[in-house]
Every structure is written in C-alpha cells, then in structure tokens.
C-alpha cells in the first residue's frame, strides 16, 4: 500500500511540477522593472524568455516577441534550451509513469516491468527538475550581474545637465514559479525512485538444504521463496479486481485495504 501511495504521490507532485515548469517557461515576467524608490510607475517593463512587454499606467499593455534567434544573448538561448529539455523530459516521464502506476492495470505487465518504468520516469523527473532549476538559476544570475552593472552606470556619466534613467530589472514571478516547480518535479522524481525499490521483486532463491539424520534420509526442499519487503503484493494472495474500471481519482478518494494491481 505504501508503495502505491509513494508512487501515486510522486506522480502527482511531478505532474504539478511539470505544469509549473511549463507555466514558468510561458510566463512573461522572468524579469521585471525594479521599482526602487518608485512603487507607482507610469511605464512598467517586464520580460520573458520569448517576448518583452510594457504596461502603461493607462492600462495599455504591449508585448513584442523576440523575432531574432541569432541576435539573442547566448545565456537566454541556454535558458530556453534548459527549460524546453526540462519540459520534454518531464512530459516523457509523465507518459512513462502513467503506465508504471501500480493502480493502473495494463494487460499482464509484471511488477519488474512496472518497477523499471517507475525508475525511468523518476530519473526523468529528477533531470527535468534539475534542468528547470538550472535554467532559472542561470537567468537569475544573469539578472543579478546586469542589475549591478546598470546600478554602476546610473551613477556614472552624469556630468551633464541631461540625465538618462537606466531601467534596472529584478526577479520576476516566473523565476519563483520555476524554482518551486523544478523542486517539486525533483521531489516527485525522488519519490518515484523510492517507490521503484518497493516495486522491484527481489528474487532470492534458497538452495535445497539436506539434513542427514541417522537411519533416515530426509531432505527439506522449500520452494522458491519470494522475499517481500512488506510493500509488495503477495503472489499467493493476489486479488485481481475485474469488477469495472476505476479511475485514479477514485483510487485516491476511496482507498481500499487491498493493493490494486
């Protein structure tokens, strides 16, 4: 039961995480104009991975896509790549994990196959989460560097009468969404890997041992004993539920004392 719970929870956590990674990647607020000294601004700038936007105090918002590929900073391209790799791996991981779920029966798939699929999806989730965290962190580092550079520029070259206000950018909401989502995907992946250990049928075949007693020759030959961690399903007491299909939600809503195979 605990294996099913761990696997199910890992799947759900990863699902939320990957949804968050997708949301973060699509969000426009990766960097937002720093409103130091000025909480109410007439023109507010914010930028995403794909476009930059300007919101005026009139309520008018204009967004412009980055229609160039070669003209973009290498770091931005790297962040885009990391986020896309994270999404792709996460999506594949989700697909694999659906079939690996213990509560879903597909043909006569053995536990060993489900265990392998669970491990595969878990590793994919871990890598996906790491990609997202790395992407967001690279972008954040880029922001911090640019922030201090623009701060330095603000106080230099102001010998003349005319001042030019340098727009400084700080962390946008997407960065926090990305960090949290990456973390959730990572946690979900770890949970899947832990669940895999419980699913894996550890075959420990004990050899027949002969005990020679005087006068009698009695051999005790126990059958192939399947070691159980306490989480796996007992092969002799397997209960196959064929009384109608159950959705995953129903499984979570109405837990049974039996494990679902």
């Amino acid at each position: 039961m605990a294996v099913t719970a761990c696997q199910g929870l890992g799947f759900v956590v990863s699902l939320i995480g990957i949804a968050g990674i997708i949301a973060a990647t699509c969000m426009d607020q990766w960097s937002t104009q720093d409103l130091y000294n000025n909480p109410v601004t007439a023109v507010f700038n914010y930028q995403g991975l794909w476009r930059s936007c300007v919101r005026e105090s009139s309520g008018f918002t204009e967004c412009r896509g980055y229609f160039t590929l070669l003209g973009l900073p290498a770091m931005l391209q790297a962040v885009r790549a990391l986020m896309i790799v994270g999404i792709v791996l996460g999506a594949i991981g989700l697909l694999v994990s659906i079939f690996a779920l213990k509560c879903i029966r597909i043909g006569s798939m053995e536990d060993s196959a489900k265990a392998n699929m669970t491990l595969t999806s878990g590793i994919m989730f871990i890598v996906s989460g790491l990609c997202a965290i790395a992407g967001v962190s690279v972008f954040a580092n880029m922001l911090v560097t640019n922030f201090w550079m623009s701060t330095a520029n603000m106080y230099t070259g102001m010998g003349g009468m005319v001042q030019t206000v340098q727009t400084r950018y700080t962390f946008g909401a997407a960065l926090f969404v990305g960090w949290v989502a990456g973390g959730l995907t990572l946690i979900g992946g770890v949970m899947m890997c832990i669940a895999c250990r419980g699913l894996a049928p550890e075959e420990t075949n004990y050899k027949a041992v002969s005990y020679h007693a005087s006068g009698h020759s009695v051999a005790y030959k126990p059958g192939g004993f399947k070691a159980s961690t306490g989480f796996g399903s007992n092969t002799k007491n397997k209960k196959i539920y064929d009384g109608g299909a159950r959705t995953e939600d129903e499984v979570q809503s109405y837990p049974s004392k039996h494990d679902y195979v």
Epitope: V40, A42, V43, E56, V165, T167
Partner: antibody
C-alpha cells in the same frame, strides 16, 4: 464613446474644503485630474487606477488632495482640503489612454478660492 | 521630477506656413522596453479643454489631421504643422508621459500674423 462630466466647483474660502466629481461613462482604466489656473498652463494633479483604486499625486498636492472613485456610481472624485488662493483654477478630469496620453477630457469645473 | 521646456513661448504665423515647436525634457523619455518615447502633444483653444494630438512622440491620435507630425527621441522633441490652417491657431503643450508626476511644458501660443 467615453463621456466625462465634472461638477462640484464653486467659491470657497481659504482653508476650506471642496469635493469635485466627475461622472464617467464608457471604458476607463485610469483617470487623472489636471488643473489650469487663469491665464496659465496645464498642471497635472493626480492619477488613479479605476480598478484597484491605486493613486499617485504631484508633490504639491500630497496630503491636501485625495483622488478616489466610486465603482457603483462610476464616478471619480477629488477631495480638496486646506485650499489656498493659488488653487484657484479650472479643474479637468481626463482619461489616460495609449502612450499615457489623455484622450478624453471633461468640460472643466471652476474652483475659486477667495475670502 | 522631469522638467519640460517649450520654445518658443509664442509665435506669429500665417495660414499655410510651416510651424515648428520644440520641447526639451530634463530626462530622457525613451523607454528601453519598447524603444518608444513617452512624450505627448496637446492643442488647447481658449475656454476649451485640451485635445490630444500626438502620443509616443510621433503617433497621431485618430481624427487628428495629417498636417500635424511629431518627432524626436531622448530629450529633444518637435511638433510640426506642415501647413497652418485657421483652426490651428491655439496653444500647444508637450507632456512627459514617461514617469509620475506627469509634467507639462509651459505652452506655445500660435497667433495669427
């Protein structure tokens, strides 16, 4: 079509108070109050986000003037306290539009501060 | 606060003349986010409310005749009336629309010569 109609102007003694109203019809995201002293130029007074109620003021009016709105009545207000002779002007309400330009203006209401 | 300085404060011109009004800001009005200059031009006739002519320094408001044009970037801006018409005799104001507090120029009065 947006229409703005101001009211509430009149004669008030120095130190007195007055509340100007601006009846708004049509879509308005944010609004301003702008004033013009007789024979002088335009002077921006205050801005308000009509949805959040977030205001901002010109330095000369902070603490004395309060911009607000009533969603139910679709009305913009300017509460003016501690009025001085130099506050004598025509007060306009104006809608902020694309490029932060003011595209629709009311007809203006005259406020005279005199003893 | 951003100071706006208009010149000249008044000018006399005849119908059909090309008129140029300049406006200088104490700070750049160019927004790096969209590369647009947040400068607005208004026309005001005596006893009337101002009328929006140009926003983003050069974008003509709908319904405004094409003889009006705006140009400039950073701190220097210009309003040009290519061929002055009788209804164009009025006072023109430039406005900082980039940051609060919004500030206006002192105005340029265009009179009949």
């Amino acid at each position: 079509e947006v229409q703005l109609v101001e009211s509430g102007g009149g004669l008030v003694q120095p130190g007195g108070s007055l509340r100007l109203s601006c009846a708004v019809s049509g879509y308005t995201f944010s609004m301003n109050w702008v004033r013009q002293a007789p024979g002088k130029g335009l002077e921006w007074v205050a801005w308000i986000n009509m949805y959040t109620g977030e205001p901002t003021y010109a330095d000369d009016f902070k603490g004395r003037f309060t911009i607000s709105r009533d969603d139910s009545k679709n009305t913009l207000y300017l509460q003016m306290n501690s009025l001085r002779a130099e506050d004598t002007a025509v007060y306009y309400c104006a809608r902020l539009s694309k490029g932060n330009g003011m595209d629709y203006w009311g007809q203006g209401t005259l406020v005279t501060v005199s003893s | 606060d951003i100071q706006m300085t208009q010149s000249p404060s008044s000018l006399s011109a005849s119908v059909g003349d090309r008129v140029t009004i300049t406006c200088k800001s104490s700070q750049s009005l160019l927004n790096s986010g969209n590369q647009k200059s947040y400068l607005t031009w208004y026309q005001q006739k005596p006893g009337k409310a101002p009328k929006l002519l140009i926003y983003w320094a050069s974008t003509l408001e709908s319904g405004v005749p094409s003889r009006f044009s705006g140009s400039g970037s950073g701190t220097d801006y210009t309003l040009t009336i290519s061929s002055l018409q009788p209804e164009d005799f009025a006072t023109y104001y430039c406005q900082n629309a980039y940051s609060f507090p919004f500030t206006f120029g002192q105005g340029t009065k265009v009179e009949i010569k």
